[in-house]
């Protein structure tokens, strides 16, 4: 990947990722330098007859660093702080080739929950106020609410009226997704409104 256009690579928090390195065809490589945010990560000297010399220069990532046979960088147990700019410089007798990468760490979505603040009106119409959430949501998480295949909301919140006298049993499903995972959680309008009705009746007695 040329230095002008970094290759963007997605990694998943806690998992492993490989930054692929392509060698100049038919040229003998003198050494390879890997950098993270312009700070040296590792210095590799390949040998034709024996194992390469690998000098890891960043102790912070050192234990989680590995290199493939083609000197691609492998980073395991990914952390959010691994996000950033990586560069590999391959030096041959005649030239230096630069490869650039941008590593983005994404979280697998976890623990989807729906909270309900619903109310019952005197005409027995139930107004549902539902809020969907996931653990550690960021701006890359997309939320939507669906019912019978139709999108009713494109936000974590859904406000909808449900009338038990004219509406059949209805499930509302929150879907949360990002580039690496998706979760869903369904709630029953009938059940939620029955709960509200019980509370409403209790307060009247």
């Amino acid at each position: 990947q040329s230095s002008l256009t970094p290759l963007m690579v997605n990694g998943i928090l806690g998992e492993s990722v490989t930054l692929p390195l392509e060698f100049p065809a038919g040229e003998k490589v003198n050494f390879i330098t890997w950098l993270f945010n312009e700070t040296s990560l590792a210095f590799i000297v390949p040998h034709e007859t024996k194992s390469p010399e690998i000098h890891v220069t960043n102790p912070k990532q050192g234990k989680r660093l590995n290199f493939t046979q083609s000197y691609s960088l492998q980073l395991s147990n990914l952390k959010m702080e691994d996000t950033g700019s990586y560069r590999a410089q391959i030096s041959t007798k005649t030239s230096a080739k630069l490869s650039s990468y941008t590593l983005r760490i994404l979280r697998q979505l976890r623990n989807i929950q729906v909270t309900n603040h619903s109310q019952l009106f005197q005409n027995m119409t139930c107004e549902l106020h539902l809020t969907c959430s996931v653990e550690d949501a960021d701006d890359n998480v997309s939320f939507r609410w669906e019912a019978l295949g139709n999108t009713l909301s494109s936000q974590p919140n859904l406000t909808v009226s449900w009338d038990p006298r004219i509406s059949s049993e209805q499930d509302y499903t929150c879907i949360a997704e990002n580039a690496v995972s998706n979760l869903s959680f369904s709630v029953s309008a009938q059940k939620l409104c029955e709960d509200v009705k019980i509370q409403y009746t209790d307060t009247k007695m």
Partner: antibody, heavy 118, light 106 residues
């Protein structure tokens, strides 16, 4: 039917401010996020950010942090884009667009042309 | 941010011909959306989530792809199809659009 109607064209001097409105009708306004997209003359589309129409919380793309403000008036189902300290490079068509989910913009306003010229 | 590169920039074809528009992302994305824009008009939703046609879009249009490579195909061009088509990704903020492919009459 579902539609977004934007305010009319604006001609402003550098340093002035402008407020573009986007009135929604035909759907529950607070259930769908509202996005803003800029298209400079002869240029591509550029996403400026969005506002959560339920909570009123705005999110701005990096290039639009500072002079750009998204706001709402839920009582009249209207989203607003305000730009302060206008520059010549702000000359563009500004679109509001409803997010149907997964940032798919299924309904667009007709666009508001903002021209900044001395 | 994820950069979307559309190719070709301009496609010169005759009515009845097949058009293939490409959109390549700088990083893997989950899905791609497509919009059509004609001069002086707002963009119109065309294809969502890679392969689903927006309401009222004729079946001669189709979308496909995964990862970093996505395609919009028009099986047989009609006069009203000549326009600019933009791809857009949603997997990462900021949401980004491609530079557009202009489909023009040859």
């Amino acid at each position: 039917q579902i539609q977004l109607v934007q305010s009319g064209s604006e001609l402003k001097k550098p340093g002035a401010s402008v407020k573009v409105s986007c009135k929604a009708s035909g759907y529950t306004f607070t259930n769908y996020g509202m996005n803003w997209v800029r298209q400079a003359p002869g240029q591509d589309l550029k996403w400026m950010g969005w506002i959560n129409t339920y909570s009123g919380e705005p999110r701005y793309a990096d290039d639009f942090k500072g002079r750009f403000v998204f706001s709402l008036d839920k009582s009249v189902n209207t989203a607003y884009l305000q730009i302060s300290s206008l520059k010549a490079e702000d000359t563009a068509v500004y679109y509001c667009a409803r997010d149907y989910g997964r940032w798919y913009f299924d309904v667009w306003g007709q666009g508001t042309t903002v021209t900044v010229s001395s | 941010q994820i950069v979307l590169s559309q190719s070709p920039a301009t496609l010169s074809l005759s009515p009845g011909e097949r058009a293939t528009l490409s959109c390549r992302a700088s990083s893997s994305v989950s899905h791609m959306h497509w919009y059509q824009q004609k001069p002086g008009q707002a963009p119109r939703p065309w294809i969502y989530a890679t392969s689903n046609l927006a309401s009222g879009i004729p079946a001669r249009f189709s979308g496909s792809g995964s990862g970093t490579d996505y395609t919009l195909t028009i099986s047989s061009l009609e006069p009203e199809d000549f326009a600019v088509y933009y791809c857009q990704q949603w997997s990462s903020t900021p949401r980004t659009f491609g530079g557009g492919t202009k489909v023009e009459i040859k």
